[in-house]
């Protein structure tokens, strides 16, 4: 017998869509072989209608697709705009049509349910509102108006003009009688439930002269949209629930067992701990739409997600909802990168950020995720030379090592730097990654003086002490600016005496500034690297003043000034906040975006945490 499995019978109606899932053993060969959907002919052949290799029959053009889900061992055939001509026997299979790896499927497309004459059909989504219009004649204008629902053989009163409301509809139904000019009454039902579906009868009057109108109410469950994203990548759920719920609390939840839907995030400030640092809820537009970005996708993020609106900020019966089925592809194109980087107070971290190597010219960004309200991500630095003022001299975004990875270096760490940071670009929005910086106990490995004052026209020598653990690393000095850190010549002055229990492999490397000018003022970094991979750095601020006494300055660790107080963030920072998700440059695929380096409050963001690998701050 064939190992392929699927639905033996599929029944639908004209104009509808079907989504046929075929299951196969997910062996390596099966995952990558051709998948097909074919129609069985009277003579026994099977004519391909669509295949995973891109073939689509003219009969299916523009109305069908086939998607393979190799991790799940499934492929899905979606067929839209069904007609009765589509009724017949089909096969879904693997390999070649005539071989045995297939499953027989019978598709039957009917005309749809038979309705009473003069029946108005109302098709409404679950949780939304329907208005059933009921015309009547003048002679019944003053008589009782009522709406019945057909339950089995019997009509059951739902609402009438004398004030009766069936308990199943309490709080969500009303009967409106139009002004005297219009011979029409209407029944409005809100927060529609699946159980509301069925045949209704509205009536004006109770005698043989009463006016009657039949209505068929169809309540549609939201068909989950299939979303297929890479492990460690990101997903955006765009949720448009309509203007009628614009002022109602919004939520995104993930269905667990049964009917439980655990809130992932909502506009009331709730956020699931598993999504800390890797989720943003974009504030809603006037029309009530909003979006949620989740980055650093994990295997366990796969599942069914619902977005909705309800005053409780969670799923309730009658909530208008939208649904997605998220599959997380473990054969990811997004490389593993550390999701936790550790540094010590006063020390530094070097964070590696992956990006889509096909987009090497894209603008790179780094932002700090903040959990307040619905989450936001103020931008700290970009690859076009912008650095947030409070980070000047201690933050740099480097295009190295390139070929799909850039580097962010942050030094002069304090406990306030602990948190989640997002790497992103203005290109592929799926490549947003998250890294958590943790500040741990310990001393910085590199030792430099605190702030240094140089004298105009004289020579300044600044020492940097490297412990033996960095003996195999390249050591450098550079001058920081907002586009990076320009390498400077330095001198190796032999073993350092700054470390206890450290042998001849420790090093003292000095930066010498000859004939100091005003242009020499600024931040200088000493650091270590291996090829294009950066390790620890230490920063020194060099101030320049007028000559007081002749001679050169040789700064030792003992003479160093105290480090300046850390600057407090001001309110005018640029950020990728809630509205960032709408910034087309980061979150939309369609539009280009204006340069935001001139904006006081630009919008940017991205994210990914994925593996639980950790990276130390002192080396990669």
């Amino acid at each position: 017998k064939s190992p392929i499995f699927g639905p033996e019978e599929v029944n639908s109606v004209e104009g509808n869509s079907v989504s046929i899932t075929c299951y196969y053993p997910p062996t390596s060969v099966n995952r990558h072989t051709r998948k097909y959907w074919c129609r069985q002919g009277a003579r026994g052949g099977c004519i391909t209608l669509i295949s995973s290799e891109g073939y689509v029959s003219s009969k299916y053009a523009g109305r069908a697709n086939l998607t393979n889900f190799p991790e799940n061992g499934t492929f899905v055939v979606n067929i839209a705009q069904l007609s009765q001509d589509d009724s017949g026997r089909y096969k879904c299979g693997l390999g070649i049509n005539s071989r045995g790896l297939s499953f027989d499927v019978s598709l039957e497309v009917s005309q749809g349910p038979g309705l009473l004459n003069d029946t108005k059909v109302y098709t409404v989504d679950l949780g939304r509102t329907v208005t059933i219009n009921c015309p009547f004649k003048t002679e019944n204008a003053q008589k009782r108006k009522s709406l019945y629902k057909q339950i089995g053989l019997y009509p059951v009163l739902v609402i009438d003009s004398s004030g009766y409301v069936n308990p199943n509809y309490t709080g969500r139904i009303r009967l409106d009688i139009q002004g005297t000019g219009q011979l029409l009454f209407s029944v409005v039902i809100n927060q529609l439930r699946l159980s509301d579906a069925g045949q209704y009868l509205c009536q004006a009057g109770d005698d043989s002269n009463s006016n009657k109108k039949n209505a068929d109410l169809q309540v549609l469950k939201p068909e989950p949209e299939l979303v297929y994203e890479d492990l460690r990548g990101s997903v955006t759920f765009h949720c448009a629930l309509g203007p009628e719920v614009a002022n109602v609390a919004k939520f995104l939840c993930r269905q667990s067992s049964g009917e439980n839907c655990d809130v992932v995030v909502n506009t009331l400030g709730k956020r699931a701990p598993a999504f800390e640092g890797r989720i943003l809820l974009n504030p809603q537009d006037k029309d009530g739409s909003f979006s949620v970005v989740i980055t650093g996708l994990r295997k366990e993020d796969a599942g069914r997600y619902l977005c909705g609106a309800h005053s409780d900020g969670q799923l309730q019966e009658g909530s208008p909802i939208q649904a997605w089925q998220l599959f997380v592809n473990e054969e990811s194109t997004i490389p593993r990168s550390p999701t936790v980087v550790k540094g010590v107070a006063g020390g530094s971290v070097a964070v590696l950020c992956p990006y889509n190597r096909k987009e090497s010219k894209s603008i790179k960004y780094w932002c700090l995720w903040e959990g307040a309200q619905n989450g936001r991500c103020p931008l700290l630095v970009d690859s076009e030379g912008w650095v947030k003022a409070q980070y000047e001299g201690r933050l740099s975004l480097l295009e190295e090592p390139g070929n799909g990875t850039f580097t962010v270096i942050l030094n002069q760490l304090t406990s306030r730097d602990a948190g989640f940071y997002w790497c992103l670009t203005n290109g592929d929005t799926l490549w947003r990654t998250t890294v958590e910086i943790k500040i741990i106990e310990g001393e910085p490995n590199l030792k430099v003086p605190g702030n240094v004052t140089a004298v105009l026209g004289e020579t300044l020598k600044v020492p940097c002490h490297f412990p033996c653990k960095f003996s195999s690393y390249e050591k450098y000095w550079c001058k920081w600016n907002n586009t990076g850190c320009q390498a400077l010549p330095s001198q190796d002055e032999g073993p350092s005496k700054a470390f206890v229990n450290c042998d001849e492999n420790s090093r003292l490397v000095s930066l010498t500034l000859n004939l100091v000018t005003r242009a020499d003022e600024g931040w200088y970094w000493c650091g270590v690297k291996q090829g294009h991979f950066y390790g620890e750095t230490a920063a020194v601020y060099v101030a320049v003043e007028e000559r007081k006494a002749a001679g050169s300055r040789d700064v030792s660790l003992a003479k160093a000034d105290a480090a300046p107080d850390e600057k407090v963030l001001d309110s005018g920072f640029r950020e990728i906040e809630n509205k960032a998700i709408q910034d087309p440059r980061l979150f939309a695929e369609e539009k280009a975006v204006a340069d935001t380096r001139d904006q006081a409050d630009g919008s940017r963001a991205s994210v990914d945490s994925g593996s639980s690998e950790e990276q130390g701050g002192s080396s990669r």
């Epitope: 639905p7 029944n11 899932t21 469950k221 269905q255 067992s257 019966e317």
Partner: nanobody, 126 residues
Framework: QVQLVESGGGLVQAGGSLRLSCAAS????????MGWFRQAPGKEREFVTA??????????YYADSVKGRFTISGDNARNTVDLQMNSLKPEDTAVYYC?????????????????WGQGTLVTVSS
């Protein structure tokens, strides 16, 4: 919570027919898949058949061992599912369980159903 109650089990002769019914009571917010499983004495529970409602279409699944003999039908609005069993064989003897799953995704043969009934015994004598 959703409670599933099976009925219709009993003793029948080989070659005979039986109709099992399953009613879901309680809040059934988004019943997408309902299935029948069975467990013969000393054996593991196995998939028999399932019905899935999605996007206005109905999908029916059957185990190879019951194809052509068993038919599943259901009413999504009333959350009921029936199993018509014809040409019964002694090897069909088992406790039959009704199951409900809130998601339309995943293999209907799997055990990842959210709710299970208590089961109804079907005995086929030779």
């Amino acid at each position: 919570q959703v409670q599933l109650v099976e009925s219709g089990g009993g003793l029948v002769q080989a070659g005979g027919s039986l109709r099992l019914s399953c009613a879901a009571s309680g809040r059934a917010f988004s019943q997408y898949t309902m299935g029948w499983f069975r467990q013969a004495p000393g054996k593991e529970r196995e998939f028999v058949t399932a019905i899935r409602w999605s996007g206005g279409s109905i999908y029916k699944y059957y185990a190879d061992s019951v194809k052509g003999r068993f038919t599943i039908s259901g009413d999504n609005a009333r959350n009921t599912v029936d199993l018509q069993m014809n040409s019964l064989k002694p090897e069909d003897t088992a406790v039959y369980y009704c199951a409900a799953r809130m998601s339309p995704w995943g293999d209907p043969r799997g055990n990842e159903y959210d709710y299970w009934g208590q089961g109804t015994l079907v005995t086929v004598s030779s």
